[in-house]
Amino acid sequence: PPNRRTCVFFEAPGVRGSTKTLGELLDTGTELPRAIRCLYSRCCFGIWNLTQDRAQVEMQGCRDSDEPGCESLHCDPSPRAHPSPGSTLFTCSCGTDFCNANYSHLPPPGSPGTPGSQGPQAAPGESIWMAL
């Protein structure tokens, strides 16, 4: 790879547990998306909260390591947790610059892979993302 991985960086107000330390923020000014150059991986992530057919971005940034899913060229979110009734967290990992800027599509919350009644589930390395 010729360049270090660069991802979109965003953390919604009220989100606990910052991933800012997983990269170096680029000075992009105010009108552009914030960008972060990953320190420990070549992998971006994104987390969206889907509530009543409305998706809201919760976090975007660098992952702390390269793990399964990071080889994806695009952000294809999968359902990960139910932080509250009627809402579902979708996360993606991908391995191209700014691939976490937006998602290709969101599967319906009830699709296979959605955690059931056992409550929130976090894939390895995702625990920091779940502290919302």
């Epitope: 360049n3 991985r5 660069t6 552009l32 420990y40 070549r42 610059d97 700014f98």
Partner: antibody
Framework: QVQLVQSGAEVKVPGASVKMSCKAS????????VSWVRQSPGQGLEWIGE????????NFNEKFKGRVTLTVDKSTSTAYMELRSLRSDDTAVYYC??????WGQGVLVTVSS | DVVMTQSPLSLPVTLGQPASISCRSS???????????LEWFQQRPGQSPRRLIY???NRFSGVPDRFSGSGSGTDFTLKISRVEAEDVGVYYC?????????FGQGTKLEIK
């Protein structure tokens, strides 16, 4: 095939500005960083900065921050670099490059009173 | 800034003989993601630079296999197994691990 074609040579007086272009073809322009590098007469190479055409995010060598603006026109797959407050030591050949794998032919900028 | 120091600065070589260029960085070029962002470029007289090697040892497409790169940390080497007439020019190492990215001062290869 991948090509980067740069604009023509420029002669400027100290204090002036110069804006040069770099037209890309043969690949998806928005998928690769465009870097700018300069080479002063008889000297080595110096990295100026880079821009990601898809979203306009750029990253600069601190030495040039405040004097350089990098922009793109996605509709024509063209990158631009503007250098302001020119000094005689800005006399150099300026290259654009697609993530350093393909390079333009260079623009000679001469700054002289 | 990370200083890239090349040696020798001038390299006279006989056609068909091997050549070796050394590049030392003032800081380790191994990044936190496990990659080392070290590249080698060739600049023939009157031409734009051309990438030969990226990631220390990966040959760029179209680059003859007589060119090879090696090294780690702060010490890197570009080797040409058998020098040909078209190899004449200036060779630069380059690091993209630290901002600002920096080039070595160049090694001029000429035919003896």
């Amino acid at each position: 095939q991948v090509q980067l074609v740069q604009s023509g040579a420029e002669v400027k007086v100290p204090g002036a500005s110069v804006k040069m272009s770099c037209k890309a073809s043969g690949y998806t322009f928005t998928d690769y960083w465009v870097s700018w590098v300069r080479q002063s007469p008889g000297q080595g190479l110096e990295w100026i900065g880079e821009i990601y055409p898809k979203n306009g995010v750029s990253n600069f060598n601190e030495k040039f921050k405040g004097r350089v603006t990098l922009t793109v026109d996605k509709s024509t797959s063209t990158a631009y670099m503007e250098l302001r407050s020119l000094r005689s030591d800005d006399t150099a050949v300026y290259y654009c490059t697609r993530q350093r794998d393909y390079w333009g032919q260079g623009v000679l900028v001469t700054v002289s009173s | 800034d990370v200083v890239m120091t090349q040696s020798p600065l001038s390299l006279p070589v006989t056609l068909g003989q091997p050549a070796s260029i050394s590049c030392r960085s003032s800081q380790s070029l191994e990044y936190g993601d496990g990659y080392t962002y070290l590249e080698w470029f060739q600049q023939r007289p009157g031409q734009s630079p051309r990438r030969l090697i990226y990631g220390v040892s990966n040959r760029f497409s179209g680059v003859p296999d007589r060119f090879s790169g090696s090294g780690s940390g702060t010490d890197f080497t570009l080797k040409i197994s058998r020098v040909e007439a078209e190899d004449v020019g200036v060779y630069y190492c380059f690091q993209a691990t630290h901002d600002p990215n920096t080039f070595g001062q160049g090694t001029k290869l000429e035919i003896k």
